[in-house]
Interface confidence: medium
Amino acid sequence: ASVGLPSVSLDLPRLSIQKDILTIKANTTLQITCRGQRDLDWLWPNNQSGSEQRVEVTECSDGLFCKTLTIPKVIGNDTGAYKCFYRETDLASVIYVYVQDYRSPFIASVSDQHGVVYITENKNKTVVIPCLGSISNLNVSLCARYPEKRFVPDGNRISWDSKKGFTIPSYMISYAGMVFCEAKINDESYQSIMYIVVVVGYRIYDVVLSPSHGIELSVGEKLVLNCTARTELNVGIDFNWEYPSSKHQHKKLVNRDLKTQSGSEMKKFLSTLTIDGVTRSDQGLYTCAASSGLMTKKNSTFVRVHEKPFVAFGSGMESLVEATVGERVRIPAKYLGYPPPEIKWYKNGIPLESNHTIKAGHVLTIMEVSERDTGNYTVILTNPISKEKQSHVVSLVVYVPPQIGEKSLISPVDSYQYGTTQTLTCTVYAIPPPHHIHWYWQLEEECANEPSQAVSVTNPYPCEEWRSVEDFQGGNKIEVNKNQFALIEGKNKTVSTLVIQAANVSALYKCEAVNKVGRGERVISFHVTRGPEITLQPDMQPTEQESVSLWCTADRSTFENLTWYKLGPQPLPIHVGELPTPVCKNLDTLWKLNATMFSNSTNDILIMELKNASLQDQGDYVCLAQDRKTKKRHCVVRQLTVLERVAPTITGNLENQTTSIGESIEVSCTASGNPPPQIMWFKDNETLVEDSGIVLKDGNRNLTIRRVRKEDEGLYTCQACSVLGCAKVEAFFIIEGAQEKTNLE
């Protein structure tokens, strides 16, 4: 057989035995002569380069460039390829020699008792167990253990070749610790050497680059890229890097295995690429490829190299941000720069710190924007290396949809006496101010909630046909006053008033305010009664544990059967729009109450007394009276609010202060609580007594010390006390300067 390409000037070496395969018996002599055109050498099995005592290579006596190979008493192990070749070329002639040795059909390796085969569990991979045969046509099977399994050639993926060995899909023997080949000759079994099976992994779970993205450097800085490959156990990994400036002198590559935790069923390999001083030519794509032989995974990242540190605002940076109350506002600081700048936010010149309502970072986030967040926000970017600064102002405008103040204050079902003049008010707060406030009305009986009519929370009235107040036919005579603007609680509000000249008809009135971000409405139940009147004694709003009486007064000649009820079990819905009176139509929702009747010359007075009022007593109370003649029922409703008892608290702190002799000190101590607390002042833990220089005003809230003297120095305490306890704040007043001598002295 010929190997290699024929040269122009050289013929292949010529063998004395002109066969591809030679079969000889054991113990005979093998002799082959090789002739050629230049210096020749022989290679033979089990000794690929020369010196073994049994093999003799001699120069031929009859010519130049001729060598004879002689092996006396050949054995099975001499089976294999014999190659004659020209030195320093790949021109060769080969003959394969089988030495038939029926006592030893497998060729033993030169190494000793066992071999090693490396396999992977890949379904598609085969492995060759190199049990070569000294006889070409043996019946060979493969034995694997433990447990013992035997595999025979199947004409497909399992086969034996005397020159190659036993081929089998690797997963079939991956369980085994060892394998060997076995041949049967004349009912006699012959075994090859044992081969230890080593399962080599190949699977790569992933390849991760760190940093994974956004890598920016300036010229001269060090680049360090870590490439981590996570693999199954028994895997070896080769790393390969591709990067823009491959001929980099300052490049360093370090590969190492990483320790994994005990119990981990994977291996980690790390390759670190370091470039000590990057240049602009190092900018570009860096790719790390990890290969296990059967599997390759890659990961890439882009490295940007800047000429020098810089900072600038991006083109998308906003200057005006508009938001509605309650929204989450995000103002991103859009910048270009390296390294990333330090970012500081200011509001109206004051630095912003992050807390649970605001996050001041790359993005200024206001969790639930309120109108007090309106203002100018300045973001200052500082380059940490060059200290270059850039600033940008963002104006935040917070819009408020119309809010109608009385909505939560006025009882929805209070009654109005027949014939009286009444003013209904809607006080609207909105940013921007409402572009209109409109009033509408509806007759009560057209809109009364019959028990059979379903009323939803979103649409609490079965009526929908609101009429404009200009059309007051069949209703009360109405006049809408011009909107007024008032500063209420420090806010600019729009006040719209509707004047009912004479309360003749029970009706519903609705004011609706609209601005650019929303609308608000308030429905007023205007129930006109000729019937009883309700008054509260002693106070409109009692506090818990105080006593209160509800008086229902009715003309005895007109009314009889006065009865007190409480509306229940749920209070009336106040905010979305309220159920209209008369509640007399639906007594199922009323709870009858015990009350005491008194009379004077003209009236019956039914008194319902609440001793030690509690928060549970809050709600709508109904006085029902029956017309003596017509037997028609009349209802009057009054909402009772019970104020919660609150222990005293003092808002704001007293500040320590230093004052010069002769000057004045003015401090205030604002306390809240229910019942309202009493305020007392102490100096050095003794009660402060008013005199010509010490003045206490506004229920002791404000303390003034006129023409301070040295002896006014000390610890001042403001204490607010009620039955629920005390609260106090303290401050130290230091008086500086020498005491002036008076004329008297």
């Epitope: 779970y205 992933d206 996570r230 119990g263 981990s264 069923e265 994977m266």
Partner: antibody
Framework: EVQLVESGGGVVQPGRSLRLSCAAS????????MHWVRQAPGKGLEWVAV????????YYADSVKGRFTISRDNSKNTLYLQMNSLRAEDTAVYYC??????????WGQGTLVTVSS | SYELMQPPSVSEAPGMTAQITCGGN??????VHWYQQKPGQAPVLVIY???ERPSGIPDRFSGSNSGNTASLTINRVEAGDEADYYC????????????FGGGTKLTVL
């Protein structure tokens, strides 16, 4: 036969606890990492937790971290999931599954957990 | 955390080729596994390590993975292939976390 059988599911009120078990047979349980994976009704698969073959390493999905605990008893060939402070969104079929790294080669048939008041 | 995007549904006529994709940032750097789930049953592994097929899975099923997309291809689609298919990877950013795609419903017309 190689199999995983889950048990311990049922109806439970929000805020309460439940413990799921998974009995393994037909393979060397102590040699394999094990997962819990869940599937809400009509929804996709959501990984819950994993434990290494010897129990020394445990990892959890963010949605259950601090509430669920995965554990195993190799002597009993059993995997556990202790579920505390249950929420309505924990309602799902819970599968126990074999193999730590790479693919999940064996799944149980699942046990239904319903969190409802 | 890492996210895998799958189309909610794919339809194909019997005998045709169906392809289901699984998108993820640089998913080619990760190993992807695919599961088939039929109604009322537990999932079954159909492709692992991007393209390997467990024994018992027909050679009509194949997989590939590179760049930002992994794909499951089913040649000569049969009625019995109608099921939900899920892709899965390990998420390295949170070590040892397993991430599933949202699932794709394969309908055989």
């Amino acid at each position: 036969e190689v199999q995983l059988v889950e048990s311990g599911g049922g109806v439970v009120q929000p805020g309460r606890s439940l413990r799921l078990s998974c009995a393994a047979s037909g393979f060397t349980f102590s040699s394999y990492g094990m997962h819990w994976v869940r599937q809400a009704p009509g929804k996709g698969l959501e990984w819950v937790a994993v434990i290494s073959y010897d129990g020394s390493n445990k990892y959890y999905a963010d949605s259950v971290k601090g509430r669920f605990t995965i554990s195993r008893d190799n002597s009993k060939n059993t995997l556990y999931l202790q579920m505390n402070s249950l929420r309505a969104e924990d309602t799902a079929v819970y599968y126990c599954a074999k193999d730590w790294s790479g693919p999940i080669t064996l799944w149980g048939q699942g046990t239904l957990v319903t969190v409802s008041s | 955390s890492y996210e895998l995007m799958q189309p909610p549904s794919v339809s194909e006529a019997p005998g045709m080729t169906a392809q289901i994709t699984c998108g993820g940032n640089n998913i080619g750097s990760k190993s992807v596994h695919w599961y088939q789930q039929k109604p009322g049953q537990a999932p079954v592994l159909v492709i692992y390590y991007d393209s390997e097929r467990p024994s018992g899975i027909p050679d009509r099923f194949s997989g590939s993975n590179s760049g930002n997309t992994a794909s499951l291809t089913i040649n000569r689609v049969e009625a019995g292939d109608e099921a939900d298919y899920y892709c899965q990877v390990w998420d390295s950013s949170s070590d040892h976390h397993v991430v599933f795609g949202g699932g794709t419903k394969l309908t055989v017309l």
